[in-house]
């Protein structure tokens, strides 16, 4: 039977080394055996490159394309092939479809004055455009109480958040995770970082009386 694309490719770039495209076929497909995504930078002399897709689900294909350090002017021509059959053709401008890398190494440390210091790493090297553009969202949730969660927006430069222990339930176990976005690039949110868990052992003030 003929091969058809149900949902055409949607692509995002981490704006440093990789762009990822995902699409859905109209029936279960062995993506790596049946399909190829070709990509070529719209720049004089550029070569055509081929990405071998992998299956994410039965009919969902994903292709990770290594790209050079992206700049705003870069535009790629994309062609999705099933053998000699062109299934889809389009263009992709990484600077207009940014999904930042996931923040790393989230840790929680006790700090002075009954506060917790949450720290993580900026996923971009200092020379990359996005290094100074990221803002973060931190989600803190009670492991035993789904209703007890807080969301903090970190809009200042440093990848840190100070959290008063008194804002959390004493003796409860909490988990935190962090994600990033780049406002000036109108990016989507990054994936969430892995969670880190700690015990909030703050004693309420009344217990001292």
């Amino acid at each position: 039977g003929s091969v058809k694309v149900l949902h055409e490719p949607s692509c995002f770039s981490d704006y440093i080394s990789t762009s990822v495209c995902q699409w859905k076929m109209d029936h279960p497909t062995n993506c790596s055996a049946e399909l190829r995504l070709s990509y070529q930078l719209d720049f004089m002399g550029s070569e055509n490159h081929t990405c071998v897709p992998e299956n994410r689900e039965d009919s969902v294909c994903v292709c990770s394309m290594p790209i050079d350090d992206a700049v705003e002017a870069d535009v790629y021509q994309l062609d999705l092939w099933a053998g000699q059959q062109l299934l889809w053709s389009g263009s992709f401008q990484p600077s207009k479809h940014v999904k930042p890398r996931t923040p790393g190494n989230l840790t929680v440390h006790p700090n002075i004055s009954h506060t917790w210091l949450l720290m993580w790493t900026n996923p971009y090297p200092t020379e990359n455009h996005l290094h100074s553009e990221l803002t973060y969202m931190v989600n803190v949730s009670n492991d035993n109480d789904p209703e007890d969660f807080k969301v903090y927006n970190v809009t200042y430069m440093g990848p840190t958040l100070r959290l008063a222990a008194s804002t959390l339930k004493s003796g409860a176990s909490y988990s935190a995770r962090v994600r990033a976005w780049a406002q000036t690039y109108n990016s989507t949110w990054s994936d969430w970082s892995p969670s880190t868990t700690w015990l909030n052992y703050y004693e309420p003030w009344e217990q001292h009386l």
Partner: antibody
């Protein structure tokens, strides 16, 4: 040492054909785009054509489009320019030059960093 | 097509002085920050052209630091300080950003 040696230039009548060759050595030929530039007697430089490293993409000046064909044989480290339907205004010294490195996703550019000695094409009846 | 306009078309300079050649393009040659696609070439009498400057300001291998390029967007300048007799020839600017690649008309530098 990088070397580019052009050959094939000759006296040819209008409407005739000629094939220029440029043999390269001293660098990884397939990694680089190659360019032809010409210079009419007493005139300035005029770009003619470019081919990327794999040979998969070619570009031409309007003045030669449809008449000239650029190609390459990476196994022989040789660049070609097939010139058909030649006209008097094609009379020039033809230079081949090493252009951008096209092995990377975005071609890396270092200028036309090496030129051949040129070969003279004369179109006259 | 991108039109390249050089000024002056000829220049006469005494040894030891500084020579400046201007090149203006009809469209911006800045692809991104730090990437200005403008080259300078020198063709000495009876020789093939040789590269001097690429990407607006980067010196080609073996080119003395007396040669410097500057500019961005549509306005570029080649400066030759402490001019020597050996610098005689025709200087061309060229844009390698878009097909067709285009050259300026050339500037003939004469040493007095």
């Amino acid at each position: 040492e990088v070397q580019l040696v052009e050959s094939g230039g000759d006296l040819v009548k209008p409407g005739g054909s000629l094939r220029l060759s440029c043999v390269a050595s001293g660098f990884t030929f397939r990694d680089y785009a190659m360019t032809w530039v010409r210079q009419a007697p007493g005139k300035g430089l005029q770009w003619v054509s470019l081919i990327n490293g794999s040979g998969g993409k070619t570009y031409y000046a309007d003045a030669v489009k449809g008449r000239f064909t650029i190609s390459r044989d990476n196994a022989k480290n040789t660049l070609y320019l097939q010139m058909n339907s030649l006209r008097a205004e094609d009379t020039a010294v033809y230079y081949c030059a090493v252009d951008r490195k096209t092995k990377t996703i975005r071609p890396q550019y270092y200028g036309l960093w090496h030129w051949g000695q040129g070969t003279l094409v004369t179109v006259s009846s | 097509d991108i039109v390249m306009t050089q000024t002056p078309l000829s220049l006469s300079v005494s040894p030891g002085e500084t020579a400046s050649i201007s090149c203006r393009s009809s469209q911006s040659l800045t692809y991104s920050i730090g990437y200005n696609y403008l080259d300078w070439y020198l063709q000495k009498p009876g020789q093939s052209p040789q590269g001097l400057i690429y990407l607006g300001s980067k010196r080609a291998s073996g080119v003395p630091d007396r040669f410097s390029g500057s500019g961005s967007g549509t306005d570029f300048t080649l400066r030759i300080s402490r001019v020597e007799a050996n610098d005689t020839g025709v200087y061309y600017c060229m844009q390698p950003l878009q097909s067709p690649l285009t050259f300026g008309q050339g500037t003939k530098l004469e040493i007095k």
